[in-house]
Interface confidence: medium
C-alpha cells in the first residue's frame, strides 16, 4: 500500500478550491492567522514591559484571551509566554491592556510567583509571574 | 501605571494597515493559516488510516514537515499528533504521503513503539508508532 506510485496517485489529482475556502487577515507578514486574528510567538526572552513594547511597535498588543472557541488554537501551545493580562492592585482585578476585565471561565489563574503579570500556558492557563522576569511572549493583532 | 485609562489610551488609537500586512490563504474555513499553508488540529482520536482519510475528505493531507523555517509554528505544538510520514519496509526509508523522502535535519526520529507511522511532537520530533493506535492528528493543505 505504501508504494510511491499509490501515494502519488492519491495526491496528484487536480483539486478545485471549494466555496468554503477563504482568506484570513490581513496580518503582518509571516504571522499566524486564525479566525481573522493574527498571532506571533517571539522566542527572545523579554520582561513584560519590553514584551508589550515589542508588540506595540508592530501595531499589536500582547495576547488577549477573549474566547475559548475563537482561540482554540491556544489549547495546544507549549511552554509559557507573556500575555497582556495585568493585576490592578488598587481593586484586585485582572485586566487586559485595553482595560477590559478578565472574563470568568476563560483562564485558570495559577499563582506561580508573587507578581502583577501573567504568562499564558497551554489549555487556557494563566500563571502569575513577576513582571520583571524575562519570558518569551505572544503578540496578537485583531484584524481591522 | 495599570489604570484602565492609561491602557485604553495606548490601544484606542486609529491604526493604518501597514503595507507589510497581507492576507493568508485561501484555507478551509476556520483553519490556521501560516506562511500560506493551512493547518488544522483535530482532537478526535483516530488511527493513522482514518486520520489520513479524514484529511483527504477535506482536500488536505496529513501534516508534511518540509521546512523548519516555513513551519516554525510547529515548534510550539503540545502533545502528539499523527502526521503523514510512513515507513517503507522494502527500502527502510521514511516517506511522506506524496511519495517524497523525509529530508535530513527536519525531524528527530524517536522509536517510541515498533511501527510504520509517525506522530509529530513539539520541536520537530517524530515518534514512531503503530499505525493502528488512535491519536489526534494534524491536517495540512498547501495553498494553491
Amino acid at each position: 500500500i505504501w508504494s510511491a506510485v499509490f501515494l502519488n496517485s492519491l495526491f496528484n489529482q487536480e483539486v478545485q478550491i471549494p466555496l468554503t475556502e477563504s482568506y484570513c487577515g490581513p496580518c503582518p507578514k509571516n504571522w499566524i492567522c486564525y479566525k481573522n486574528n493574527c498571532y506571533q510567538f517571539f522566542n527572545e526572552s523579554k520582561n513584560w514591559y519590553e514584551s508589550q513594547a515589542s508588540c506595540m511597535s508592530q501595531n499589536a498588543s500582547l495576547l488577549k484571551v477573549y474566547s475559548k472557541e475563537d482561540q482554540d488554537l491556544l489549547k495546544l501551545v507549549k511552554s509559557y509566554h507573556w500575555m497582556g493580562l495585568v493585576h490592578i492592585p488598587t481593586n484586585g482585578s485582572w485586566q487586559w491592556e485595553d482595560g477590559s476585565i478578565l472574563s470568568p471561565n476563560l483562564l485558570t489563574i495559577i499563582e506561580m510567583q508573587k507578581g502583577d503579570c501573567a504568562l499564558y500556558a497551554s489549555s487556557f492557563k494563566g500563571y502569575i509571574e513577576n513582571c520583571s522576569i524575562p519570558n518569551t511572549y505572544i503578540c496578537m493583532q485583531r484584524t481591522v | 501605571i495599570w489604570s484602565a485609562v492609561f491602557l485604553n489610551s495606548l490601544f484606542n488609537q486609529e491604526v493604518q494597515i501597514p503595507l507589510t500586512e497581507s492576507y493568508c490563504g485561501p484555507c478551509p474555513k476556520n483553519w490556521i493559516c501560516y506562511k500560506n499553508n493551512c493547518y488544522q488540529f483535530f482532537n478526535e482520536s483516530k488511527n493513522w488510516y482514518e486520520s489520513q482519510a479524514s484529511c483527504m475528505s477535506q482536500n488536505a493531507s496529513l501534516l508534511k514537515v518540509y521546512s523548519k523555517e516555513d513551519q516554525d509554528l510547529l515548534k510550539l505544538v503540545k502533545s502528539y499528533h499523527w502526521m503523514g510520514l510512513v515507513h517503507i519496509p522494502t527500502n527502510g526509508s521514511w516517506q511522506w504521503e506524496d511519495g517524497s523522502i523525509l529530508s535530513p535535519n527536519l525531524l528527530t526520529i524517536i522509536e517510541m513503539q515498533k511501527g510504520d507511522c509517525a506522530l509529530y511532537a513539539s520541536s520537530f520530533k517524530g515518534y514512531i508508532e503503530n499505525c493502528s493506535i488512535p491519536n489526534t492528528y494534524i491536517c495540512m493543505q498547501r495553498t494553491v
Epitope: - | E69, N91, S103
Partner: antibody, heavy 123, light 107 residues
Framework: QLQLQESGPGLVKPSETLSLTCTVS??????????WVWIRQSPGKGLEWIGN???????HYNPSLKSRVIISVDTSKNQFSLKLKSVTAADTAVYYC???????????????WGQGTTVTVSS | DIQLTPSPSFLSASVGDRVTITCRAS??????LAWYQQKPGKAPKLLIS???TLQSGVPSRFSGSGSGTEFTLTISSLQPEDFATYFC?????????FGQGTKVEIK
C-alpha cells in the same frame, strides 16, 4: 571503504557550462542512508556548499547558485554530476564531491570527500 | 543565510601549546556545528560533529564545546601534524555555510 573521484575539464570558458562527474566506489550510490553533496573552495569565497542530492533524485541547492545549478544522479553508473551554467571567473575554484555523515535523519558534517578538482574559468 | 565568524583568523603557536578557536553563528544553530581540519592541497577532514562529538580516529587532544551561537574547538597539546587550517560549518539549515577558517601556524 567508500571513495569518491571527481572528473571533468579543468578549463571552462566564460558563459559556458561547467560539468563535473563524481564516481562512487566501495558502496552503492542508491543506498537509502546516503546523500551526496558538491562543495567548492576558492581563495575569495572560502568553502561554499553548492547542493545535495539523494539517490531518489531529490535535491537541495544553495539559493545563491540555484538558478544556474543542476545536480543529478545516475544509479546505473554509480555516479552523480554537477552542471553549473553561465560560468564567470568567480566560479574558478576547487570542486569537491562528498558524502555527508547522516544518522537518524540528521546531517552531522561531511565525512567522505573526493580529492577535489581544480576548475579555472578563463577564455 | 547563517553567517559563521571564526576567531582568530590566524594563530601562531608552539608544539605543546593549548589552542582555542572560536566560531560564532549569526543565529542559534542548536548543536549542529562541525569542525574540519584542512592541510594544503588536501580535502577537509571532519574532526568533530555535532559540536562536541569526536569522530572516530580523531585524537583525543581535540575537543569541541558550545551550543546555540558560540562554539569552541580546543587542541589541548598542539602536535606538529596539527598545523593546518580549521573550519567550522553549520548544518542547522540550508544553505549550509562555512566559516572562513583559522590558520594555525608554527611560532
Amino acid at each position: 571503504q567508500l571513495q569518491l573521484q571527481e572528473s571533468g575539464p579543468g578549463l571552462v570558458k566564460p558563459s559556458e557550462t561547467l560539468s563535473l562527474t563524481c564516481t562512487v566506489s566501495g558502496g552503492s550510490i542508491s543506498s537509502s542512508s546516503y546523500y551526496w553533496v558538491w562543495i567548492r573552495q576558492s581563495p575569495g569565497k572560502g568553502l561554499e556548499w553548492i547542493g545535495n542530492i539523494y539517490s531518489s533524485g531529490s535535491t537541495h541547492y544553495n539559493p545563491s547558485l540555484k538558478s544556474r545549478v543542476i545536480i543529478s544522479v545516475d544509479t546505473s553508473k554509480n555516479q552523480f554530476s554537477l552542471k553549473l551554467k553561465s560560468v564567470t571567473a568567480a566560479d574558478t575554484a576547487v570542486y569537491y564531491c562528498a558524502k555527508p555523515l547522516l544518522r537518524d535523519y540528521y546531517y552531522y558534517g561531511v565525512d567522505v570527500w573526493g580529492q577535489g578538482t581544480t576548475v579555472t574559468v578563463s577564455s | 543565510d547563517i553567517q559563521l565568524t571564526p576567531s582568530p583568523s590566524f594563530l601562531s603557536a608552539s608544539v605543546g601549546d593549548r589552542v582555542t578557536i572560536t566560531c560564532r553563528a549569526s543565529q542559534a544553530i542548536s548543536s549542529y556545528l562541525a569542525w574540519y581540519q584542512q592541510k594544503p592541497g588536501k580535502a577537509p577532514k571532519l574532526l568533530i560533529s555535532p559540536a562536541s562529538t569526536l569522530q572516530s580516529g580523531v585524537p583525543s587532544r581535540f575537543s569541541g564545546s558550545g551550543s546555540g551561537t558560540e562554539f569552541t574547538l580546543t587542541i589541548s597539546s598542539l602536535q606538529p601534524e596539527d598545523f593546518a587550517t580549521y573550519f567550522c560549518q553549520q548544518l542547522n539549515s540550508f544553505p549550509w555555510t562555512f566559516g572562513q577558517g583559522t590558520k594555525v601556524e608554527i611560532k
